[in-house]
């Protein structure tokens, strides 16, 4: 007989999700309208393509990247889509309320959809640390809290530190990673006896995770350049991201082989390390003046990613209860920090070059920005973790962790699914 949600969740989830959706529809009805300004169709299509790239990254890239669990691949992909769809809606409203609302209605443009998709991506990065241990009702809470926290962080950084869209969105890596890790820390950790096999990866889901990694790899230049101001900045960002991810692939595969006693390549290492360069150059992708620098960063990022994948999972599994294959959280936390440090180093070099105290002050501001992003991520993550532990959500029992059968109807249930 197929497994079902507990009765209470069957009442709670549809009611909670549909009520929320109805509330969002009402908010859109009363407070938003489309940008009615004239724009040529060619330009519109070009602008839409960037948003499309971001959606592909989110839905297919991150959706499949998290699907490597042996018995949790369906849930990983579908829950990601659910969170993306919900997250984009809430992010559009929130960004509008925070930045435009005093002037009247929220105007929805292709740029606001682009921003919202990037905000929702944050949730998809974070959720990697908790997928398999939470149900959809809990994920709805996580989406709402994280998108709200990120939106407010970006607004505060924009107003206090005077940073542009690109700079404040590039905190997403660090923010998402620390948010996810702090939520995971709050959830019940030990996997009970008899469920150890469920958080193992299987060949076909691992292949789909590799497919996700490939999609992310292809579209990462679009992500890093999406919010930049001029064609020259975007061009430099695309080039540098491409060089960095290209080198991180080579580093990931060879580094993975080097890290194994028999010289074998680990799928898990490769899944995450291929993206390492893109994350590391994110903040300063438009500032790097030549390919060799981007390539060096890709190399360093690849090595850090492989090193992290080798030595951190044990610690993460013990302390945070994160399975070995869910390495996006600590991977992004390390690489996001690397990216932020690179940007700060560039500012320090400016200070040395100019001998100017004001630029030194800029370095302090950037450190302050980074610290604020981490603090807000940790605090909102802990708050989310505590909320998710409430009994009302009817969280899956530990024995049902990483199990698609808890959530999905399968016509023929094979034991080894």
């Amino acid at each position: 007989m197929s497994s079902k949600y507990p009765r209470s969740v069957r009442r709670c989830l549809p009611l909670w999700a549909l009520t929320l959706e109805a509330a969002l529809i009402l908010l859109f009805y009363f407070f938003t309208h489309y940008d009615a300004s004239l724009e040529d169709q060619k330009g519109l299509v070009a602008s839409y393509q960037v948003g499309q790239d971001l959606t592909v990254m989110a839905a297919i890239g991150l959706g499949f990247l998290t699907s490597s669990f042996r018995r949790h691949s369906w849930s990983s992909v579908a829950f990601n889509l659910f969170m993306l769809a919900l997250g984009v809606q809430w992010a559009i409203l929130l960004d509008g309320f925070l930045s435009q609302f005093p002037s009247g209605k929220v105007v929805i443009t292709l740029f606001s959809i682009r921003l919202a998709t990037m905000s929702a991506l944050s949730v998809l990065i974070s959720v990697d640390a908790v997928l398999g241990k939470v149900n959809l009702a809990q994920l709805v809470v996580m989406v709402l809290v994280e998108v709200t926290a990120l939106g407010n962080l970006r607004m505060v950084i924009s107003n206090i530190f005077n940073t542009d869209y690109h700079m404040n969105m590039m905190h997403i890596y660090v923010f998402a990673a620390y948010f996810g890790l702090s939520v995971a820390w709050c959830l019940p950790k030990p996997l009970p006896e008899g469920t150890e096999d469920k958080d193992q990866t299987a060949t076909i889901p691992s292949l789909s995770a590799m497919l996700g990694a490939l999609f992310l790899w292809m579209f990462w230049p679009s992500f890093n350049s999406a919010l930049l101001r001029s064609p020259i900045e975007r061009k430099n960002a695309v080039f540098n991201t491409y060089y960095a991810v290209a080198v991180s692939v080579v580093t990931a595969i060879s580094g993975s082989s080097l890290a194994h006693p028999q010289g074998k390549i680990s799928k898990t290492y490769v899944h995450s390390a291929v993206l390492a360069g893109g994350v590391a150059v994110g903040t300063s992708c438009h500032l790097i003046p030549s390919p060799w620098l981007a390539m060096v960063l890709g190399l360093v990022a690849g090595l850090i990613s492989v090193g992290g994948a080798k030595y951190l999972p044990g610690c993460c599994n013990r302390v945070l209860g994160i399975p070995h294959s869910s390495i996006m959280g600590y991977n992004f936390s390390l690489l996001g920090l690397l990216g932020e440090i690179i940007y700060i180093v560039l500012l320090v070099l400016d200070t040395v070059g100019a001998g100017n105290g004001m630029i030194g002050f800029q370095v302090l501001l950037s450190i302050g920005e980074l610290s604020l992003a981490i603090v807000i991520a940790l605090m909102s993550g802990l708050l989310t973790g505590l909320l998710l532990n409430l009994k009302i959500w009817k969280a899956p029992h530990e024995a049902k962790y990483f199990d698609d059968q808890v959530f999905w109807k399968f016509p023929h249930l094979a034991v080894g699914f």
Epitope: S47, T109, S230, I288, L346
Partner: antibody, heavy 129, light 108 residues
């Protein structure tokens, strides 16, 4: 040569709407951000709005948010400013300006500086009952 | 928004004089500062970008300096065609570009 020509100004009653246009020529319009800047009689220059090269993003001065809409049609090499709910304080000469990105680099980083390098002659908007 | 304060608001000078106009930002704008010249009935003209870089076609008697919050426009030897109003403008915060109040340079 590079040229910007504004049009659409005139005498309008308070509360009415107006649409200003700026026709660009002599450069690749779709590669540059564009601005509207105004100067009220006896006052200084006041920045009004910017639109990015691809039209994807727009920013407005706090004083005009919600009433003014900047847009562009790259296929027609034209910039627009839609002004709604006109007030007496909107009386000014409105200039459109091309934004140029000045790009330089050292061995370790790129620098991008932006300035309005080409301006139109302006169009006058007078709000009066 | 970042406030830009120019001083003096007006000055009288003679042809051949060295003229200095200062501009102060309410917070650090690094080198993101431009200077414009505006004559009555004419369009503004870009003189200096990035605090000290001379726009092509602008005479070398114009120069700019400064970074952070304090900036200066200097006209080394004032010419008859230089009598105009000069504006500084910060380009550090794209979301809210701001001009200084202007400095009117008049004939003594």
């Amino acid at each position: 040569q590079v040229q910007l020509v504004e049009s659409g100004g005139g005498v309008v009653q308070p509360g009415r709407s107006l649409r200003l246009s700026c026709a660009a020529s002599g450069f690749t319009f779709s590669s540059y951000g564009m601005h509207w800047v105004r100067q009220a009689p006896g006052k200084g220059l006041e920045w009004v709005a910017i639109i990015w090269f691809d039209g994807s993003n727009k920013y407005y001065a706090d004083s005009v948010k919600g009433r003014f809409t900047i847009s562009r049609d790259n296929s027609k090499n034209t910039l627009y400013l839609q002004i709604n709910s006109l007030r007496a304080e909107d009386t000014a000469v409105y200039y459109c300006a091309k934004e140029h990105g000045y790009y330089s680099s050292s061995w370790y980083r790129n620098y991008y500086y932006y300035a309005m390098d080409v301006w139109g002659q302006g169009t006058t908007v007078t709000v009066s009952s | 928004d970042i406030q830009m304060t120019q001083s003096p608001s007006s000055l009288s000078a003679s042809v051949g004089d060295r003229v200095t106009i200062t501009c102060r930002a309410s917070q650090s704008i690094r080198r993101y500062l431009n200077w414009y010249q505006k004559k009555p009935g004419k369009a503004p003209k870009l003189l200096i970008y990035a605090a000290s870089s001379l726009q092509s076609g602008v005479p070398s008697r114009f120069s700019g300096s400064g970074s952070g919050t304090d900036f200066t426009l200097t006209i080394s030897s004032l010419q008859p065609e230089d009598f105009a109003t000069y504006y500084c403008q910060q380009s550090y915060r794209t979301q809210g570009l701001t001009f200084g109040g202007g400095t009117k340079v008049e004939i003594k």
